[in-house]
Interface confidence: low
Amino acid sequence: APPRLICDSRVLERYILEAKEAENVTMGCAEGPRLSENITVPDTKVNFYAWKRMKVEEQAVEVWQGLSLLSEAILQAQALQANSSQPPESLQLHIDKAISGLRSLTSLLRVLGAQKELMSPPDATQAAPLRTLTADTFCKLFRVYSNFLRGKLKLYTGEACRRGDR
């Protein structure tokens, strides 16, 4: 990946909009298509004020762990969807787009150096375990995807890119 492409806000915005389109196509979280089993996903909640005061290395750990779990979750959803009778074409398309998007974002973050922090996180003994929740519909899964990109990922890349510019 070209160096620091993730620092161009339009790149991340494209993936966020794709994620929101996927959420919209699933017809709402109450009545939309359900997953045949619950899938573990990262909790996207972010305490803005606490996050803002975290070291960028600590943010990187949370982002990387969340991205890994999210990738596993969407791959799991793809497998469940493949085993279902008559999977809707549009849903399949958005799952494929999400998988492709997460792979691209993972590559872009590697260039930014986020995975280095996971290998040797600061104060590893004190690092809080990643909070998780479960998704039982495709809508909830895509909402978590969208919220993760708009939340922790966007906040982290904004700060990491600012640091890199100094």
């Epitope: 909009l17 909640k45 305490n47 803005f48 004020y49 708009r150 939340g151 922790k152």
Partner: antibody, heavy 127, light 108 residues
Framework: QVQLQQSGPGLVKPSQTLSLTCAIS??????????WNWIRQSPSRGLEWLGV?????????DYAVSVKSRITINPDTSKNQFSLQLNSVTPEDTAVYYC?????????????????WGRGTLVTVSS | SYVLTQPPSVSVAPGKTARITCSGD??????VEWYQQKPGQAPVLVIY???DRPSGIPERFSGSNSGNTATLTISRVEAGDEADYYC??????????FGGGTKLTVLG
């Protein structure tokens, strides 16, 4: 139920300092889960967020770019209130000033939602 | 600086659906809130995080946000819904941005 009670003068002379206070009941100004904001509203500028103060092991603040050089928001833990000071005011600063509480911890965005507001204080800047 | 644009006014008949829009560059990538303000009163939060309702806000109020536009939808409009409505978003680290406001008039 959180309540915010505002007080301060309604008339300030140009070049002087605008000072307002917001007394909190139902919560603590030094709560680790809340943030305390000032927002103003005028016909010419609409609603305008001015700044925030919050406590997370120590005190932090953030101010709007438009007033950064003139604004100070301070806590008063003994009285459970917080104050706004805006220096070197001009008639452009004439507005209804509101204090408001926001709560962090939801999906990103929720911490900015102003769920509780004071009633507002009309401040006129005039000689 | 970031700008949120709202129509100055929207009119709707009682019982019908009102839609108030808020547009900004790539607004769908930010979170949007909506506030209702009646004359002489402080604003009241009716929607946060694009589409969530605080407790006490009727289900008739809903929100969405995609692309460049966020929309506040009020179904089965009542006379008591007549007010000014403001969208807001935190588009940067420190600044909250409010839209210019939309006056909702309930006809009849």
């Amino acid at each position: 139920q959180v309540q915010l009670q505002q007080s301060g003068p309604g008339l300030v002379k140009p070049s002087q300092t605008l000072s307002l206070t917001c007394a909190i009941s139902g919560d603590s100004v030094s709560s680790n889960t809340a943030a305390w904001n000032w927002i103003r509203q005028s016909p010419s500028r609409g609603l305008e967020w001015l700044g925030v103060i919050y406590y997370r092991s120590k005190w932090y603040n953030d101010y709007a770019v438009s007033v950064k050089s003139r604004i100070t928001i301070n806590p008063d833990t003994s009285k459970n209130q917080f104050s706004l000071q805006l220096n070197s005011v001009t008639p452009e600063d004439t507005a209804v000033y509101y204090c408001a509480r926001s709560v962090p911890g939801g999906d990103p965005g929720l911490e900015h939602a102003f769920a509780y507001w004071g009633r507002g204080t009309l401040v006129t800047v005039s000689s | 600086s970031y700008v949120l644009t709202q129509p100055p006014s929207v009119s709707v008949a009682p019982g019908k659906t009102a839609r108030i829009t808020c547009s900004g560059d790539n607004l769908g990538t930010y979170y949007v809130e909506w506030y209702q303000q009646k004359p002489g009163q402080a604003p009241v939060l009716v929607i946060y995080d694009d589409s969530d309702r605080p407790s006490g806000i009727p289900e008739r109020f809903s929100g969405s946000n995609s692309g460049n536009t966020a929309t506040l939808t009020i179904s089965r409009v009542e006379a008591g819904d007549e007010a000014d409505y403001y969208c807001a978003s935190f588009a940067s680290w420190s600044d909250s941005v409010f839209g210019g406001g939309t006056k909702l008039t309930v006809l009849g």
